[in-house]
């Protein structure tokens, strides 16, 4: 049995900070879990991960290239990323694994969320040369 996950298809970011919510078809408070966020079409980079269960709030830790934190309720894990740059524009996938008690469960791969980080253009007002 695979768990389903819903993610927003696109998030356009112009503030260098984003919150990505992963909504699961399973009660997160029922079991001990590991929630993670992956970057790239092949989910090559684990961006952020947190372990949680019914008795404690998870500690989220991030890949060296990212700054992240997270939170969860009974059906949603929300990852917050900040200090984002244009080169962080990519597709991001939510993943969840329920470890204890058995049986092990994980989610069907979703369509992911494209996070588009907009480039900040500084406007330079050119003063016209004096004649």
């Amino acid at each position: 049995n695979k768990i389903l996950v819903k993610q927003s298809p696109l998030l356009v970011v112009d503030s260098n900070e984003v919150s990505l919510s992963c909504r699961y078809s399973y009660n997160l408070l029922a079991k001990e879990f590991r929630a993670s966020l992956y970057k790239g079409v092949n989910s090559d980079v684990e961006v952020c991960v947190g372990n949680g269960n019914f008795t404690y709030q998870p500690q989220f830790r991030s890949n060296a290239e990212f700054n992240c934190d997270g939170d969860f309720d009974n059906e949603t894990v929300t990852f917050r990323l900040w200090n984002l740059h244009v080169n962080h524009t990519d597709i991001y996938f939510c993943k969840i694994e329920f470890m204890y008690p058995p049986p092990y469960l994980d989610n069907e791969r979703s369509n992911g969320t494209i996070i588009h980080i907009k480039e900040k253009h500084l406007c330079h007002t050119q003063s016209s040369p004096k004649l």
């Epitope: 001990e32 993943k95 694994e97 470890m99 204890y100 008690p101 058995p102 049986p103 092990y104």
Partner: antibody, heavy 120, light 111 residues
Framework: EVQLVESGGGLVQPGGSLRLSCAAS??????????VGWIRQAPGKGLEWIGE???????YYNPSLKSRVTISRDNSKNTLYLQLNSLRAEDTAVYYC????????????WGQGTLVTVSS | DIQLTQSPSSLSASVGDRVTITCRAS??????????LHWYQQKPGKAPKLLIY???SLQSGVPSRFSGSGSGTDFTLTISSLQPEDFATYYC?????????FGQGTKVEIK
């Protein structure tokens, strides 16, 4: 036929590190449905769970050892590894790898074990 | 962590005897009607061998003289008629919560 074969044991100095291997055959470490754990047994003592790795590559560790242990794998070799740092005399034990199924997490196949002795 | 306490720690028995070993957990290891409690046999110099999984299911290839029962916190391993090859140490293990824990073992010796 499922087989697990550990190697890499021997004499290690206190404060040193060990890296044990567990070569799996008869099943794939990256196939959903099974994972592999490490368990150790000090001479004349009981069994202690060290940690485990799932088909996804996710790991879980015993909190009593978490700061010193890393479990990893090489899918191309179908081999599991245990790295244990800052070794002390109490880490002297036979180290086993064992397969578990995802339905009940019972260890249904075990390796023969490899002895690690920590001594100067 | 869930503590597992086995009793007795050791016992002496004769071939043909009925032997019972108990395992008590510090909290319930049941989830959705399944008990995540397993039994292993270990002989000197050998790796443990799975006998019973999920409290009462006999592992393939294990003789039917071995049986397991119990739920919640109290579990029993029974050997209905002890055979010479059964002299060994027996361990219970829980997989309900991480970290997985084992009982301290019960050594079955020849009387």
């Amino acid at each position: 036929e499922v087989q697990l074969v550990e190697s890499g044991g021997g004499l290690v100095q206190p404060g040193g590190s060990l890296r044990l291997s567990c070569a799996a055959s008869g099943f794939s470490l990256s196939t959903s449905g099974v994972g592999v754990g490490w368990i150790r047994q000090a001479p004349g003592k009981g069994l202690e769970w060290i940690g485990e790795i799932y088909h996804s590559g996710s790991t879980y560790y015993n909190p009593s050892l978490k700061s010193r242990v890393t479990i990893s794998r090489d899918n191309s070799k179908n081999t599991l590894y245990l790295q244990l740092n800052s070794l002390r005399a109490e880490d002297t034990a036979v180290y086993y790898c064992a397969r578990y199924k995802y339905d009940y997490y019972d260890f249904d196949y075990w390796g023969q074990g490899t002895l690690v002795t920590v001594s100067s | 962590d869930i503590q597992l306490t086995q009793s007795p720690s050791s016992l002496s028995a004769s071939v043909g005897d009925r032997v019972t070993i108990t395992c008590r957990a510090s909290q319930s290891v049941d989830f959705h009607g399944i008990s995540f409690l397993h039994w292993y046999q270990q002989k000197p110099g050998k790796a443990p061998k799975l006998l019973i999984y999920a409290a009462s299911s006999l592992q393939s290839g294990v003789p039917s003289r071995f049986s397991g029962s119990g739920s919640g916190t109290d579990f029993t391993l029974t050997i209905s008629s002890l055979q010479p090859e059964d002299f060994a140490t027996y361990y219970c293990q829980q997989s309900y919560r991480s970290p997985r824990t084992f009982g301290q073992g019960t050594k079955v010796e020849i009387k």
